[in-house]
C-alpha cells in the first residue's frame, strides 16, 4: 500500500494493518543473578527483572526462566546492553607470569532457541578482550539488529562470565525486543 | 487487528491507526558547548543542535534547552553516541601519583525528567573506565533502548565530563528518540 | 490520524497507512573481503552476505556492490557493528620507536552516497584508539541511529583498516536499515 | 540449591598453619568466585581474599599476603583456605562464601571455628 | 583501603519502630554498597545490593539509599526477627571492606 490513500468502501480486499501500540514489546533489566548450574561448553544466560523500575512486557511478549518468547511471527529489533566490571593487575605482568585471575575477554551473545531445532542460534555477539592496566575496570557491551523471528522462537542473553556483571543499576545492564 | 483484514465499512468501530510519517521523531547531533553552571552531584547536560545538517525535529518533539519534550505517550526508541576524547600519561603512574589530569571514567546517561515526579530518572547508562597508555585517546559510548514515556515527558543526554566530548563533527555524537 | 478512529466509507480522503510487513528493510552481514582497489583519502567500503543465513533484504531494499539502496523515501533506523581484531606489542614501544605495525585507531562509518550530491554524507562515525597492552586484542564499535533518506540514496560501511575486520561469524559484523 | 558445606573446628598453636575445607553443592562450582571472610570472637567481619575456581587466580588482602594461601580441586567442587604462621589473634570464625559476582556474598558457608592457643 | 564507618554502634527500639542504620565510605563507591543481617551463631545474610536493590525474599520493609559516600539502611516497621547485627560492605574495589557493625537490641 505504499503511499496508496485506501480504496473506497466497495473495494473489499485490505493489507493487514495494525495498531502499533498492539505489538509485541519487552523492557528487560538486570537483577542480581543466583548462581546457577551452567551447561558444558555453554555461555550462561542471565535472567532479567520483567515488571519493576523501568522493566515491562506487553501485547503477550513474554518473559519466562531468562527466555523473551516470540508470540508472533515477524521482523523484531532486538537489543541488549551489558556492563562487566573486574579487578585486574598489570595486564601484562598477568600474561608475562601466565597468571589466569582475570578474564582475557567479556562477551556478550543474544542467542535465539527454537524448539523444531536442535542447536540454539547466536544472532548477536559483542566480544572484547580485557587487558586493563588500572586496578578497577568497568565498560559495557552494546549490541543490537533486526532479525525475522517466528512464533514460538525464544530469545536469551548469554555472557562469558557472570560474576562480572554490573547488577547493581537497571540502566546499565538490559535486554529488550519489539516488533517492527 | 493483528493480522485481520478490515472489516467492510459497515462496521464503524476501527483501532487508532496512524500513519507512521506522522509520528514523533527527532535526531539531535552534537555542537560545541557553553561553560555553563552545573548542579552539585549531577552529570552537566549536553545541548544539541536540531535543524542543521542531519539533525531535524518533526511531528511536534521539540527540542528546547536542552530537552527533548516528548509530545505524546507511547514507547519510544531512545539513543545517543557521545565521543570522548583525552590527553593522558600513563595511567598506572596517575594513580600512584594521584595526579588528576585524568577521569577514571567517562560515563552517558540518557535521563527523563518528569514535571510531577521530583526525582530524575535515569534510562540509560553507559559508563567506562579510562586507563590509556598512549598518550592520545578517543572512543564512543553508545546507548539505545525502548522505554514507555508520557506525555510532558523530557530527556536530556548527561555526561560525567562536557570537557572531554569530541564535538568536533554531527556523526560522532548525537542523541535521537522516535515513538514506534 | 492520530488516536482517530477511522472515518465512514463515504469519506474518500486517507492517510497514508501501510502494512509493517511492506516496509523496505535488510540486515547483512559479514563475508570475507577480497583484497580491491581503495580510493585515496577514502577509508575501503565492506562487502556484505545479504541472503544466506541471518542476511536477508526485503520489500524493494536491495543490496549490490556493497551498497544498500533506498527504494523509498523516509525515516530510516541505521545500524552496524564491526568486530576489529588485531595483533600488537606493548602500546608505549610502538608509539616511541614510531614502528607502524598497528592502527593509532579504529573506525567504523555509514555514508550516505546521493548521485545528485557531488560528495558522500557521512551518516555516523565510530571511532576509537586502540592502546592495547597485550598481544591479542579484539573489540566491536557498534552505531545506530534515525536518518532521513530519499528514494536511490545508497548507503555503505567503511571502515579505517579492512584486514582488521573480524569476518568469521555473521554474529560479529553486521549492518541492516529499516524504514520506521 | 547452593550449599556450602566446611570442615570441623581446629585447634592450633601459634607458629602452626590451618586448612579449612569448603564443599559447593547446587551450582557450578568454576562459575562463580569463592572468597573467605573471618569473624574473631564478639568482632566484625573482615575479608581475607578470594579463588577463581576456573583458573585457581587468587586476590589476597594485603594484610594476609604471604601467610593465606586459596586453592581448589574442581573434580570435587571443594575450595581450600590454608593460614601459616598462626597467632593467637587469628582466632575467628572462618567463612567461605559465593555469590554472583565477584564482591557479594549471597551464600555462605557454616563457619569454622579455628582456636589458636598455646 | 576504603574505609567504611556505621552509626550508630547500637541501638535500642521496639517492635514497630522505624530505624535507620548510616554507613560512610572513606572515598566515593558509586551505588557498589552491599547490606547484610547477622544473628548470634550464624552466617551474615545477604539484604541489599547496589545501595537500595532488595535481594530476592529480603521482606519489603528493609530499604537502602545513597550513593558516593553516604549511605543508609532503613526498617521502616521493626518485626521481632529483626533484631541482630547489621553490617555494611564497599564492593567497589578490593580489598573488600565491611562496617564495623551496628548492633539493634529490643528496648
Known amino acids: 500500500l505504499k503511499g496508496q490513500e485506501f480504496a473506497p468502501s466497495h473495494q473489499q480486499v485490505y493489507a493487514p494493518l495494525r495498531a502499533d501500540g498492539d505489538k509485541p514489546r519487552a523492557h528487560l533489566t538486570v537483577v542480581r543473578q543466583t548462581p546457577t548450574q551452567h551447561f558444558k561448553n555453554q555461555f550462561p544466560a542471565l535472567h532479567w527483572e520483567h515488571e519493576l523500575g523501568l522493566a515491562f512486557t506487553k501485547n503477550r511478549m513474554n518473559y519466562t526462566n531468562k527466555f523473551l518468547l516470540i508470540p508472533e511471527s515477524g521482523d523484531y529489533f532486538i537489543y541488549s546492553q551489558v556492563t562487566f566490571r573486574g579487578m585486574t593487575s598489570e595486564c601484562s605482568e598477568i600474561r608475562q607470569a601466565g597468571r589466569p585471575n582475570k578474564p582475557d575477554s567479556i562477551t556478550v551473545v543474544i542467542t535465539k532457541v527454537t524448539d523444531s531445532y536442535p542447536e540454539p542460534t547466536q544472532l548477536l555477539m559483542g566480544t572484547k578482550s580485557v587487558c586493563e592496566v588500572g586496578s578497577n575496570w568497568f565498560q559495557p557491551i552494546y549490541l543490537g539488529a533486526m532479525f525475522s523471528l517466528q512464533e514460538g522462537d525464544k530469545l536469551m542473553v548469554n555472557v562469558s562470565d557472570i560474576s562480572l556483571v554490573d547488577y547493581t543499576k537497571e540502566d546499565k545492564t538490559f535486554f529488550g525486543a519489539f516488533l517492527l | 487487528l493483528k493480522g485481520q483484514e478490515f472489516a467492510p465499512s459497515h462496521q464503524q468501530v476501527y483501532a487508532p491507526l496512524r500513519a507512521d510519517g506522522d509520528k514523533p521523531r527527532a535526531h539531535l547531533t552534537v555542537v560545541r558547548q557553553t561553560p555553563t553552571q552545573h548542579f552539585k552531584n549531577q552529570f552537566p547536560a549536553l545541548h544539541w543542535e536540531h535543524e542543521l545538517g542531519l539533525a531535524f525535529t518533526k511531528n511536534r518533539m521539540n527540542y528546547t534547552n536542552k530537552f527533548l519534550l516528548i509530545p505524546e505517550s507511547g514507547d519510544y526508541f531512545i539513543y545517543s553516541q557521545v565521543t570522548f576524547r583525552g590527553m593522558t600519561s600513563e595511567c598506572s603512574e596517575i594513580r600512584q601519583a594521584g595526579r588528576p589530569n585524568k577521569p577514571d571514567s567517562i560515563t552517558v546517561v540518557i535521563t527523563k525528567v518528569t514535571d510531577s515526579y521530583p526525582e530524575p530518572t535515569q534510562l540509560l547508562m553507559g559508563t567506562k573506565s579510562v586507563c590509556e597508555v598512549g598518550s592520545n585517546w578517543f572512543q564512543p559510548i553508545y546507548l539505545g533502548a525502548m522505554f514507555s514515556l508520557q506525555e510532558g515527558d523530557k530527556l536530556m543526554v548527561n555526561v560525567s565530563d562536557i570537557s572531554l566530548v569530541d564535538y568536533t563533527k554531527e556523526d560522532k555524537t548525537f542523541f535521537g528518540a522516535f515513538l514506534l | 490520524l492520530k488516536g482517530q478512529e477511522f472515518a465512514p466509507s463515504h469519506q474518500q480522503v486517507y492517510a497514508p497507512l501501510r502494512a509493517d510487513g511492506d516496509k523496505p528493510r535488510a540486515h547483512l552481514t559479514v563475508v570475507r573481503q577480497t583484497p580491491t582497489q581503495h580510493f585515496k583519502n577514502q577509508f575501503p567500503a565492506l562487502h556484505w552476505e545479504h541472503e544466506l543465513g541471518l542476511a536477508f533484504t526485503k520489500n524493494r531494499m536491495n543490496y549490490t556492490n556493497k551498497f544498500l539502496l533506498i527504494p523509498e523515501s523516509g525515516d530510516y533506523f541505521i545500524y552496524s557493528q564491526v568486530t576489529f581484531r588485531g595483533m600488537t606489542s606493548e602500546c608505549s614501544e610502538i608509539r616511541q620507536a614510531g614502528r607502524p605495525n598497528k592502527p593509532d585507531s579504529i573506525t567504523v562509518v555509514i555514508t550516505k552516497v546521493t548521485d545528485s550530491y557531488p560528495e558522500p554524507t557521512q551518516l555516523l562515525m565510530g571511532t576509537k584508539s586502540v592502546c592495547e597492552v597485550g598481544s591479542n586484542w579484539f573489540q566491536p564499535i557498534y552505531l545506530g541511529a534515525m536518518f532521513s533518506l530519499q528514494e536511490g540514496d545508497k548507503l555503505m560501511v567503511n571502515v579505517s583498516d579492512i584486514s582488521l575486520v573480524d569476518y568469521t561469524k555473521e554474529d560479529k559484523t553486521f549492518f541492516g536499515a529499516f524504514l520506521l | 540449591q547452593v550449599q556450602l558445606v566446611q570442615s570441623g573446628a581446629e585447634v592450633k598453636k601459634p607458629g602452626a598453619s590451618v586448612q579449612v575445607s569448603c564443599k559447593a553443592s547446587g551450582y557450578t562450582f568454576t562459575g562463580y568466585y569463592m572468597h573467605w571472610i573471618r569473624q574473631a570472637p564478639g568482632q566484625g567481619l573482615e575479608w581475607l581474599g578470594w579463588i577463581i575456581p576456573n583458573s585457581g587466580g587468587t586476590n589476597y588482602a594485603q594484610k594476609f599476603q604471604g601467610r593465606v594461601t586459596m586453592t581448589r580441586d574442581t573434580s570435587i567442587s571443594t575450595a581450600y583456605m590454608e593460614l601459616s604462621r598462626l597467632r593467637s589473634d587469628d582466632t575467628a570464625v572462618y567463612y567461605c562464601?559465593?555469590?554472583?559476582?565477584?564482591?557479594?556474598?549471597?551464600?555462605w558457608g557454616q563457619g569454622t571455628l579455628v582456636t589458636v592457643s598455646s | 583501603d576504603i574505609q567504611m564507618t556505621q552509626s550508630p554502634s547500637s541501638l535500642s527500639a521496639s517492635v514497630g519502630d522505624r530505624v535507620t542504620i548510616t554507613c560512610r565510605a572513606s572515598?566515593?563507591?558509586?551505588?557498589?554498597l552491599n547490606w547484610y543481617q547477622q544473628k548470634p551463631g550464624t552466617a551474615p545474610k545477604f539484604l541489599i545490593y547496589g545501595a537500595s536493590r532488595l535481594q530476592s525474599g529480603v521482606p519489603s520493609r528493609f530499604s537502602g539509599s545513597g550513593s558516593g559516600t553516604d549511605f543508609t539502611l532503613t526498617i521502616s516497621s521493626l518485626q521481632p526477627e529483626d533484631f541482630a547485627t547489621y553490617y555494611c560492605q564497599q564492593s567497589d574495589t578490593t580489598p573488600i571492606t565491611f562496617g564495623q557493625g551496628t548492633r539493634l537490641e529490643i528496648k
Open positions: 572515598q566515593s563507591i558509586s551505588s557498589y
Open positions: 562464601a559465593t555469590g554472583s559476582s565477584w564482591e557479594g556474598f549471597d551464600y
